[in-house]
């Protein structure tokens, strides 16, 4: 067996920079996905976003978000997702449980899945950044 090193003390500006990068990349992904015309958002898919019972940045459901984006990467070769995954990995603990995603098989339904999750991911990163900055403000007052 191996011993983990001393717990990493990460400055809040690093975490904020990661989430800002994710927010920017999420907008790029959504812009790319929205170029596909005639695809509607579906009510059948929900991306887990923030957990109410944890402090930022641990309140971001990073492992689940990663799994959903990995699924999109497999369905549609969006290279921006590679960079998104690398940044999400900065927020994911090594022992975080895996998330299984059921992938749609119908081509049109796949497009709806991609659009829906991309849109929710973009909204989620906006919320995550807000929760980080409001958390930081509360900490200084």
């Amino acid at each position: 067996s191996h011993t983990l090193p001393v717990r990493l003390l990460r400055p809040s500006d690093d975490v904020q920079k990661i989430v800002e990068e994710l927010q920017s990349l999420s907008k790029m992904l959504l812009k790319d996905v929205e170029e596909e015309k005639g695809v509607l958002v579906s009510q059948n898919y929900t991306l887990p976003c923030l957990s109410p019972d944890a402090q930022p940045p641990n309140n971001i459901h990073s492992p689940a978000i990663r799994a959903y984006l990995k699924t999109i990467r497999q369905l549609d070769n969006k290279s921006v997702i590679d960079e998104i995954i690398e940044h999400l990995d900065k927020l994911i603990f090594q022992d975080a449980p895996e998330t299984n995603i059921s992938v749609p098989t119908d081509t049109h339904e796949c497009k709806r899945f991609i659009l829906t999750i991309s849109q929710q991911f973009s909204e989620c990163m906006d919320l995550a950044l807000k929760s980080l900055t409001s958390g930081a403000q509360q900490a200084t007052t």
């Epitope: 983990l4 990661i18 990995k70 900065k90 994911i92």
Partner: antibody, heavy 122, light 107 residues
Framework: QVQLVQSGAEVKKPGSSVKVSCKAS????????MQWVRQAPGQGLEWMGA????????RYSQKFKGRVTITADKSTSTAYMELSSLRSEDTAVYYC???????????????WGQGTTVTVSS | AIQMTQSPSSLSASVGDRVTITCRAS??????LAWYQQKPGKVPKLLIY???TSASGVPSRFSGSRSGTDYTLTISSLQPEDVATYYC?????????FGGGTKVEIK
């Protein structure tokens, strides 16, 4: 005790391929990135690519894209780096390395293989 | 790709001297930087990770610091066994490029 053991030295002809293995032991986690680095004689360290063994996700340096393939066999905890269309400039020591830490993303490579010398000569 | 510019490429100092090596990132990489020591014919060894955290078993004379996109490795009192080449590497986004290396010798 975490250990990375690489395959032995290779002598290859120009135009051929080489496949270097890297077996990890004493490490139980699945969420991590392993990297491959090479060092030509008298030169610095050069990043070649990385793999997330848990799902086979890979990243490659633009310089090696199309010539390098990194794979992993979860069942044997072994990663592989294959370099094709070898030329004399590929003569180098090839290293695998991976991190320790609490996050899936690395912030330093704590463990290194012993290195595999690949000589490309006609 | 993010470029890591390391300086100086070589230096010669006396035993007991304070030695500083710098790496400059071409963009903000936060604290995602590591420093390695490589002795001739040996495997690279991690000294510092996350810009300023010492790896296990590393002597206290080695320290890392950051100012914006500039990262510094300091050897507070150079010892004969510190003769080696030192490299930085960033981990912000792939490719995880290395600096060109700094060869440290004893005067």
């Amino acid at each position: 005790q975490v250990q990375l053991v690489q395959s032995g030295a290779e002598v290859k002809k120009p135009g051929s391929s080489v496949k270097v293995s890297c077996k990890a032991s004493g490490y139980t986690r699945t969420r991590y990135w392993m990297q491959w680095v090479r060092q030509a004689p008298g030169q610095g360290l050069e990043w070649m690519g990385a793999i997330y063994p848990g799902e086979g996700d890979t990243r490659y340096s633009q310089k090696f894209k199309g010539r390098v393939t990194i794979t992993a066999d979860k069942s044997t905890s072994t990663a592989y780096m294959e370099l094709s269309s070898l030329r004399s400039e590929d003569t180098a020591v090839y290293y695998c390395a991976f991190p320790e830490g609490q996050y899936a993303a690395p912030y330093g490579m704590h463990y290194w293989g012993q290195g595999t010398t690949v000589t490309v000569s006609s | 790709a993010i470029q890591m510019t390391q300086s100086p490429s070589s230096l010669s100092a006396s035993v007991g001297d304070r030695v500083t090596i710098t790496c400059r990132a071409s963009r903000n990489i936060g604290n995602y930087l590591a420093w390695y020591q490589q002795k001739p014919g040996k495997v690279p060894k991690l000294l510092i990770y996350y810009a300023k955290t010492s790896a296990s078993g590393v002597p206290s004379r080695f320290s890392g610091s950051r100012s914006g996109t500039d990262y510094t490795l300091t050897i507070s009192s150079l010892q004969p066994e510190d003769v080696a080449t030192y490299y930085c590497q960033h981990f912000w986004s792939t490719p995880w490029t290395f600096g060109g290396g700094t060869k440290v010798e004893i005067k």
